[in-house]
């Protein structure tokens, strides 16, 4: 069937499915040291892990790839692990003249689902 | 340097990277041969290939998670081709009294992006 | 654009509670970074900051006052409170909340006058 | 706690005067210094971030320096806007910090 298990119940055990996992990375890491200024370090949330049939499917198409790739595995990828949505996050730039404040919508991941 | 390649030219060769690709599908592929009366075949527009360095990347996030997977690629995932748009698709239901029609705007991808 | 007001009691006696509330407008309070923090001013002196609150809910306080300071947010009314307890007349002062971006503080609120008095 | 201190407590300078006020910390804050500027009943407005990082809108003629336990703010050339009392803030750690401000007049 296609609901065998929970859609948010991961039958590879615990860590491996698809969820939010923090990375730490510097400005240097990402190479905007030249024009970001604060903050200097970023806790930046990332999806990772697999995506089992049907777990957290992100839609109908994500449940039929899911679907699919049971049948066609050469052909039809799994669904992968993706952002749902994101949380902004302010970073002060450098400017010609000084700094200023900008946000970003789409920089750290707050959920996640596989799509 | 973050722009060595144009984010649309693909350097693993011709079909290589993430793109549409079309899967033929019956209803009883779907699983969908007992709700749906039509279509009987769908022709699925699906995203699939690989995501190479800022390769169509959906946005910030994504061109963060291709630097840090090239720092960390134990750790960090490469980004992967997904949906960036829908193509509405009508299906005939079977009902209990007969047919209707409805629209699904998450079933057939139009475009794919590396996230 | 980045507005904030605060808004309080005016006048209270000594040893009541004083609660003030910061409403944002222009950015959220959940936003990574982004944090909203309490100063005040008596007349004719100089800034005392005293407490702060970030996006994820970390707190900070005066050393001072902290028995006395409690902060808190409500990220969907945009709204951040800070109470004060058993004030007394030392406490009088204009209160201000500002926005706080990665430690200093890049918008303020125009004030609110808090006088304690018998 | 980290203790600020300006200097002096209060400057008369004339219009286009090159007007310099120090803040000096009592422990190494690094470049983590702010400087703000409060006109009469208004609420302090931000200046410089980051010791030397002049804020969107402010004017060129304002400036910062320093690091470690010395600071400058300097207006390169005095208007008679500038009339106000200005303050520096470490935020290099808890709890933050204000200078006891400048007072800053014109003769």
């Known amino acids: 069937s296609a609901h065998a298990h929970p859609r948010d119940s991961c039958p590879l055990g615990p860590g491996r499915c698809c969820h939010l996992e923090t990375v730490q990375a510097t400005l240097e890491d990402l190479g905007w040291s030249d024009w970001v200024l604060s903050p200097r370090q970023l806790q930046l949330s990332m999806c990772v892990g697999e995506c089992p049939h049907l777990y957290r499917s992100a839609n109908t198409h994500a449940q039929i790839k899911a679907r699919l790739h049971g049948l066609q595995p050469d052909k039809v990828p799994a669904p992968c692990c993706v952002p749902s949505s994101y949380t902004p996050v302010v970073l002060m730039h450098r400017t010609d003249s000084g700094v200023s404040l900008q946000t970003y919508d789409d920089l750290v991941a707050r959920g996640c689902h596989c799509a | 340097s973050a722009h060595a390649h144009p984010r649309d030219s693909c350097p693993l060769g011709p079909g290589r990277c993430c793109h549409l690709e079309t899967v033929q599908a019956t209803l009883e592929d779907l699983g969908w041969s007992d709700w749906v009366l039509s279509p009987r075949q769908l022709q699925l527009s699906m995203c699939v290939g690989e995501c190479p360095h800022l390769y169509r990347s959906a946005n910030t996030h994504a061109q963060i998670k291709a630097r840090l997977h090239g720092l960390q690629p134990d750790k960090v995932p490469a980004p992967c081709c997904v949906p960036s748009s829908y193509t509405p698709v009508v299906l005939m239901h079977r009902t209990d009294s007969g047919v209707s029609l409805q629209t699904y705007d998450d079933l057939v991808a139009r475009g794919c992006h590396c996230a | 654009q980045v507005q904030l007001q605060e808004s309080g009691p005016g006048l209270l006696k000594p040893s009541q509670t004083l609660s003030l509330t910061c409403t944002v407008s222009?950015?959220?309070?959940?936003?990574?970074?982004?944090?909203v923090g309490w100063i005040r001013q008596p007349a004719g002196k100089g800034l005392e900051w005293l407490a702060n609150i970030w996006w994820n809910d970390d707190k900070y306080y005066n050393s001072a006052l902290k028995s006395r300071l409690t902060i808190s947010k409500d990220t969907s009314k945009n709204q951040v409170s800070l109470k004060l307890s058993s004030v007394t007349a030392a406490d009088t002062a204009v209160y201000y909340c500002?926005?706080?971006?990665?430690?200093?503080?890049?918008?303020w609120g125009q004030g609110t006058l808090v006088t304690v008095s018998s | 706690d980290i203790q600020m201190t300006q200097s002096p407590s209060t400057l008369s300078a004339s219009v286009g005067d090159r007007v310099t006020i120090t803040c000096k910390a009592s422990q190494n804050v690094g470049t983590n210094v702010a400087w703000y500027q409060q006109k009469p009943g208004q609420p302090p407005k931000a200046l410089i971030y980051s010791a030397s990082y002049r804020y969107s809108g402010v004017p060129d003629r304002f400036s910062g320096s320093g690091s470690g336990t010395d600071f400058t703010l300097t207006i390169s050339s005095l208007q008679a806007e500038d009339v106000a009392v200005y303050y520096c803030?470490?935020?290099?750690?808890?709890?933050?910090?204000f200078g006891q401000g400048t007072k800053l007049e014109i003769k």
């Open positions: 222009g950015f959220s309070l959940s936003t990574y970074g982004m944090g």
């Open positions: 803030q470490q935020y290099n750690s808890y709890p933050l910090t």
């Open positions: 500002a926005q706080e971006v990665y430690g200093w503080f890049a918008y």
